[in-house]
Structures are given as structure tokens and as C-alpha cells.
């Protein structure tokens, strides 16, 4: 698999995977006590035909061409966990594995 | 997790999973030996914002709201593979599971 | 820059009670644990339980439970240690320093900031 | 509750000496120890955290090591403005407990 990484100076059009630090404490979600803050990255960009698809799925859509079926767009085909630390609903304290919470690649899907 | 099945009557207009049966045949893709057709269905429909969200990290993006993000997008968020026997390169037959050829649920991401 | 000022020196009677403040400033106070610490005069230190402003979870020291209240005034970024039926071996300077996390592991955290500290006496 | 022995309770050391405090636990603490410097009439300060690890504008001249039960700060090189009350502490579990201190004197 195959994934373009960008920044904000980058002058790619093409979905690509951008830097995002998410911070909880700017947020206002002080019930995350640990990490305050951490690097979640994006995905931003176009998606023509073929370029960067993640499914042979995508490009079949594309060929039936059904009612209402968009072009694909530019999302993340990988991503990883964060170890968090965090208060629950009952107000206990939970370290737990987040999925799904780091963008590793991006794809058009 | 939940996702939306729809069908060519339906009137939503969020993200669903709608029917659509590709034909190889009618593709002229006369490599693939079997299955001549298959269900694969799409994906499609609107994405308001925590409506049907695979990940909190698309949440989060939201809030961030980095330059150049658009709102998530109605996208397979589970997938399964079919047997598929099919013509390689070097003209051998081959039968083996295609992984992400059928969407099973439709999300936001 | 992240600050913890505490309230002027103390004299209390035996039997009665005394409510010592740290306010917070340079940081957002809500999203991080307290902790009081105290100290007898020539003596070490002796940790005395924590708070989380965001919702008034506290653990403390079974060595004070029956007599230690925290809380927290998030309105004004302020927090509490109350100390009920003083006795003289409670004269001690009483710090509040706030819990910093390296880390997202229970323990993965250490004091990064001190209040200047606060002197109760208890005294007849 | 987790007891910590530190040793020497005091100790006199010239300008330039290498010193060490040694920090015993009663019980494994996972490397989770911190050490404090406190300066008479102040409010202690962070040195290391997690063992081994340098406080943020903390010189490295102090150095933390150990695991399991045993721990050490050592100071390489002596100067006028090291010399105060150092503390170990666990956060292994609560309560938190504290080393009773070492005092540093000037020889």
C-alpha cells in the first residue's frame, strides 16, 4: 500500500495525508486526563480515477456507475491506536487502547 | 457498529448502503473465469456531521478543523472478500479469496 | 507561565479547623490533578491525597480520610485542602503541586509545579 | 503502604565532588520514582522523574538509574547551589510515600 504525506507548505491537489495535532485541553475534554494532546494527522485532497485506490471495489463502482454513486474520496485506509488515560461515565479512571485514533495512510475509497 | 441499508426507492438521503450487482461480463473483464456477476453494493448518501461515524478521530478533525479538511464521506466501513476464479499475467488459472470486494456497511470518515 | 499561589501562614486552636487555598493560573486548571503535600517543621514530606477539578474525584491518604476534605473552585481556578481537629502535630507547611503526565500510563506523571507553601501552626 | 529508605540521612561533600543518594523501596515500584531538591524556607523541586529521566531546565549533572527496588541520584560535580535536601519519592501506588531525605552539606 501506498499513501502520499504532505504539510502545509506542500502544493499537492492529491489526496494526501496531512499533520494535525488534536488538542484535548483546547478542546475543553478535560476528561482525558493523559495524552493532552497528540498527533492525529488528516486526509485532504482529490481523488481521479484510480489514483491511490485502496479496493478493486472502488474502480467496479466506478465502471456500473449506479444512481447516485459519488467519486471516491480521500480517507484514511490505515490507521493506529493511542494508549489513553481518561475518566468514564461512572467518573473511573480507565487506561485503555483507542482504536482508530492516528491517521497512517490515506487512500481513495 | 450500525449502518443504513438502502434500496433504489429509498428516500434517504444520509449514507447507505445501496444494492449493486457487478457484471463482469457486461465489463468485457472475460479474464474472471467465475463468478461471471457478484453483489457488491455502494456506498452513498450524505454526511452530517456525527452521523455514522466509524472513528472518533474524524470527530476530532472536526473539531480541529485544519485548513483544507472536508466533512467525512459516506465510505465502506466494512468489507468482506469473495472466491473469485480468474485468468493471471502468465495465463495460469487462479482461484483464490479478492479480499474488500463487498461492502458490508456504509459509515462516515 | 503555569503558577500555584497559596494563601498566608495559619494559627489555629486545637480541636478547630483550617482551609488553605492554591490558585491556579497559566494553565488550564480543570484538566489537571492537585495534589497537597505537607511538611513538619524539620521533618520530611508526607503526601496527603489528590483532586481533579473536572469532576471532584479525590483519593487520599488513609492516614488523614477521616479528617481531610479537597475541593476545587474551578470558577476561580482554586483549590481546597480543609484539615478538621487540628492537633500540634499537624503544625506543618502544606504545599499543593500539580500532577504533570509524561506519559498515558497511570503512573507515568510527576510534580512539575509547587505552591509556595502555607504555615499552619496549632498551637494553645 | 510502600516504605522508602534513603541513605545517607546526611551527608558533607566539598565544590567538585561526585555524590551519590541511594533510595531503597519496600516493594518493587516499577521505576516509577521521582527525586526533589529543597532548599530551606522553598518548596521542593522536580529533578528526575520515572528513574532516569531529566526534569525539563534541570542540569544534567544530576543523574538518575536503578529499577526494581533500589535507586540512586548522583550529582557529578558539586557546586555551591546543590547544596540542600534531596528526596525520593514512589508513584507506583497510593499512598504516595517519600524517602525521609538526605542533607547535603558543604564540607
Known amino acids: 500500500d501506498f499513501g502520499l504525506d504532505c504539510d502545509e507548505h506542500s502544493t499537492e491537489s492529491r489526496c494526501c495525508r496531512y499533520p494535525l495535532t488534536v488538542d484535548f485541553e483546547a478542546f475543553g475534554w478535560d476528561w482525558i486526563i493523559a495524552p493532552k494532546r497528540y498527533k492525529a494527522n488528516y486526509c485532504s485532497g482529490e481523488c481521479e480515477f484510480v489514483f491511490l485506490q485502496k479496493y478493486p471495489h472502488t474502480h467496479l463502482v466506478h465502471q456500473a456507475n449506479p444512481r447516485g454513486s459519488a467519486g471516491p474520496c480521500c480517507t484514511p485506509t490505515k490507521m493506529s491506536p493511542i494508549n489513553m488515560l481518561y475518566f468514564n461515565g461512572k467518573e473511573q479512571i480507565i487506561y485503555g487502547k483507542i482504536p482508530a485514533m492516528v491517521v497512517d495512510r490515506c487512500g481513495c475509497s | 457498529d450500525f449502518g443504513l441499508d438502502c434500496d433504489e426507492h429509498s428516500t434517504e438521503s444520509r449514507c447507505c448502503r445501496y444494492p449493486l450487482t457487478v457484471d463482469f461480463e457486461a465489463f468485457g473483464w472475460d479474464w474472471i473465469i467465475a463468478p461471471k456477476r457478484y453483489k457488491a453494493n455502494y456506498c452513498s448518501g450524505e454526511c452530517e456531521f456525527v452521523f455514522l461515524q466509524k472513528y472518533p478521530h474524524t470527530h476530532l478533525v472536526h473539531q480541529a478543523n485544519p485548513r483544507g479538511s472536508a466533512g467525512p464521506c459516506c465510505t465502506p466501513t466494512k468489507m468482506s472478500p469473495i472466491n473469485m476464479l480468474y485468468f493471471n499475467g502468465k495465463e495460469q488459472i487462479i482461484y483464490g479469496k479478492i479480499p474488500a470486494m463487498v461492502v458490508d456497511r456504509c459509515g462516515c470518515s | 507561565q503555569v503558577q500555584l499561589v497559596q494563601s498566608g501562614a495559619e494559627v489555629k486552636k486545637p480541636g478547630a479547623s483550617v482551609k488553605v487555598s492554591c490558585k491556579a493560573s497559566g494553565y488550564s486548571f480543570t484538566g489537571y490533578f492537585m495534589h497537597w503535600v505537607r511538611q513538619a517543621p524539620g521533618q520530611g514530606l508526607e503526601w496527603m491525597g489528590n483532586?481533579?477539578?473536572?469532576?471532584?474525584?479525590?483519593n487520599y491518604n488513609q492516614r488523614f480520610k477521616a479528617r481531610v476534605t479537597m475541593t476545587t473552585d474551578t470558577s476561580t481556578s482554586t483549590a481546597y485542602m480543609e484539615l478538621r481537629s487540628l492537633r500540634s502535630d499537624d503544625t506543618a507547611v502544606y504545599y499543593c503541586?500539580?500532577?504533570?503526565?509524561?506519559?498515558?500510563?497511570?503512573?507515568?506523571?510527576?510534580?512539575?509545579?509547587w505552591g509556595q507553601g502555607t504555615l499552619v501552626t496549632v498551637s494553645s | 503502604d510502600i516504605q522508602m529508605t534513603q541513605s545517607p540521612s546526611s551527608l558533607s561533600a566539598s565544590v567538585g565532588d561526585r555524590v551519590t543518594i541511594t533510595c531503597k523501596a519496600s516493594?518493587?515500584?516499577?521505576?516509577?520514582l521521582s527525586w526533589f531538591q529543597q532548599k530551606p524556607g522553598k518548596a521542593p523541586k522536580s529533578l528526575i522523574y520515572?528513574?532516569?529521566r531529566l526534569v525539563d531546565g534541570v542540569p544534567s549533572k544530576f543523574s538518575g538509574s536503578g529499577s526494581g527496588t533500589d535507586y540512586t541520584l548522583t550529582i557529578s560535580s558539586l557546586q555551591p547551589e546543590d547544596f540542600a535536601t534531596y528526596y525520593c519519592?514512589?508513584?507506583?501506588?497510593?499512598?504516595?510515600?517519600f524517602g525521609q531525605g538526605t542533607k547535603l552539606e558543604i564540607k
Open positions: 503541586a500539580r500532577r504533570y503526565y509524561y506519559d498515558t500510563g497511570p503512573a507515568d506523571w510527576y510534580f512539575d509545579v
Open positions: 519519592l514512589q508513584s507506583d501506588e497510593f499512598p504516595l510515600t
Open positions: 483532586i481533579y477539578p473536572y469532576n471532584g474525584v479525590s
Open positions: 516493594q518493587d515500584i516499577n521505576s516509577y
Open positions: 520515572r528513574a532516569n
